[in-house]
């Protein structure tokens, strides 16, 4: 089983975390993607794209790995049927690290210097053969991890945090849904910049195809940005009526979201949601809940906040 | 996931210098920029100095030729030479890592010039 595992994620597949005995895997290439797909929970869903199975409470694994960032712009994956279009103004962006914030004094050009067409068509290619490599390195670690060998030296692991730190950290963090395929983490955080410090943007990325999945999550310095930021629950941006709405901390064994494949066993399960928030789960992009096929969730784990 | 750690932060007289450090470890990506912020008591986050991905380096007005900013991707690590400090350059120096998905902020270290 193991060794399947490793092989499926040596072939393309490279989420899921541990490969132990007995550990379920379903190699189905990732559904969804939709814009504001995912419920708002699920410290899980914070990592950038790895996926795996719903975990039972004691198949949880204490120490979060490095995720894979798709850094380049994947190419703009079409609207599912039912999630709102790309909206006015959601042409995407140039890199936003080539802007200068304004009141800024340019420096020192270093090799940034506006050369001939060729030359900088070069050094595109360059970049993306860069980007590809660091892609290619991540992926290998992930399945190194899988196989349960230690990644090559230098790369420097995870801080481990406790669950009690992670649930603090859900506490300071909001969901915020129906964001542009074309938007970048820069943009978020300006969009949220008068709501308080932000610690960290992660906008999710589909691990198989790179695509951004259309939704994003904002940690704070405090929970009390948590609170303002709610008040922008609504508002446009890049064109898009975004959704804004606390992070909820996942329970051990529920899955944050529900993408319709039958498990291999049937489990029925209820999940509470509070009134505040029917609202979001009955209107945008949700399914039914509690029903007695489960889906394979994408959180890595109930207690891991990114 | 990045994670990052700035250090060399301290107290200092007027006219005297830091070297800051920020080292990023994780899943790092070499074209992601990382840059130096700050935030003095009430005050907003200021951006201090940056470098694009196209190697260009920026300074906020209020820094520029006392400031230096330095980056090596072999070593993950972003480093700010502060010179002839000021009082008003008294505030907690952030670093931050910005990628197209990814932002990180790391936890600061504070910088406090006595005049």
């Known amino acids: 089983m193991a060794a399947a595992a490793a092989a499926a994620a040596a072939a393309g597949a490279a989420g899921g975390r541990g490969s132990g005995p007995g550990r379920r895997r379903h190699l189905v290439p990732g559904a969804g993607g939709e814009a504001g797909e995912g419920a708002p929970g699920g410290a899980g869903d914070y990592g950038n794209g790895l996926e795996s199975e719903e975990l039972e409470p004691e198949e949880l694994l204490l120490e979060p790995e490095p995720e894979p960032e798709p850094e380049e712009e994947p190419p703009r994956p079409r609207a599912p049927p039912g999630a709102p279009g790309p909206g006015p103004g959601s042409g995407a962006p140039g890199s936003q690290e080539e802007e200068e914030e304004p009141g800024l004094v340019e420096g020192d050009p270093g090799d940034g210097a506006i050369e001939d067409p060729e030359l900088e068509a070069i050094k595109a290619r360059v970049r993306e053969m860069e980007e590809e490599a660091e892609k290619l390195k991540e992926l290998q670690n992930e399945v190194e991890k899988q196989m349960n060998m230690s990644p090559p030296p230098g790369n420097a692991g995870p801080v481990i945090m406790s669950i009690e730190e992670k649930m603090e950290a859900d506490a300071r963090s909001i969901y915020v849904g129906n964001v542009d395929y074309g938007a970048t983490a820069e943009e978020l955080e300006a969009h949220f910049h008068g709501c308080g410090s932000v610690n960290r943007v992660t906008i999710l990325c589909d691990k198989f195809s790179g695509h951004p999945k259309g939704f994003a999550y904002i940690e704070f310095s405090d929970k009390e940005s948590v609170r303002t930021s709610l008040a922008l629950d609504e508002s446009l941006f890049r064109g898009r009526q975004i959704k804004v709405i606390p992070k909820r901390t996942n329970r051990p064994g529920i899955s944050t979201t529900d993408r319709g494949f039958p498990r291999a066993r049937y489990r029925a399960r209820t999940t509470n949601y509070n009134s505040s928030r029917s609202r979001f789960y009955s209107g945008f992009n949700s399914r039914p809940r509690g029903r007695v096929y489960r889906g394979r969730a994408r959180a890595t784990s109930w207690y891991s906040p990114y | 996931a990045v994670q990052l750690v700035e250090s060399g932060g301290g107290l200092v007289q007027a006219g005297g210098s830091l070297r800051l450090s920020c080292a990023a470890s994780?899943?790092?990506?070499?074209?992601?920029?990382m840059g130096w912020y700050r935030q003095a008591p009430g005050n907003q986050r200021e951006l201090v100095a940056t470098?694009?991905?196209?190697?260009?380096?920026s300074y906020a007005g209020s820094v520029k030729g006392r400031f230096t900013y330095s980056r090596d991707n072999a070593k993950n690590t972003v480093d700010l030479q502060m010179n002839s400090l000021k009082p008003e350059d008294t505030a907690v120096y952030y670093c931050k890592y910005s990628s197209r998905w990814n932002i990180y902020w790391g936890q600061g270290t504070l910088v406090t010039v006595s005049s």
């Open positions: 470098m694009s991905s196209s190697g260009i380096t």
């Open positions: 994780g899943s790092i990506v070499s074209l992601a920029t």
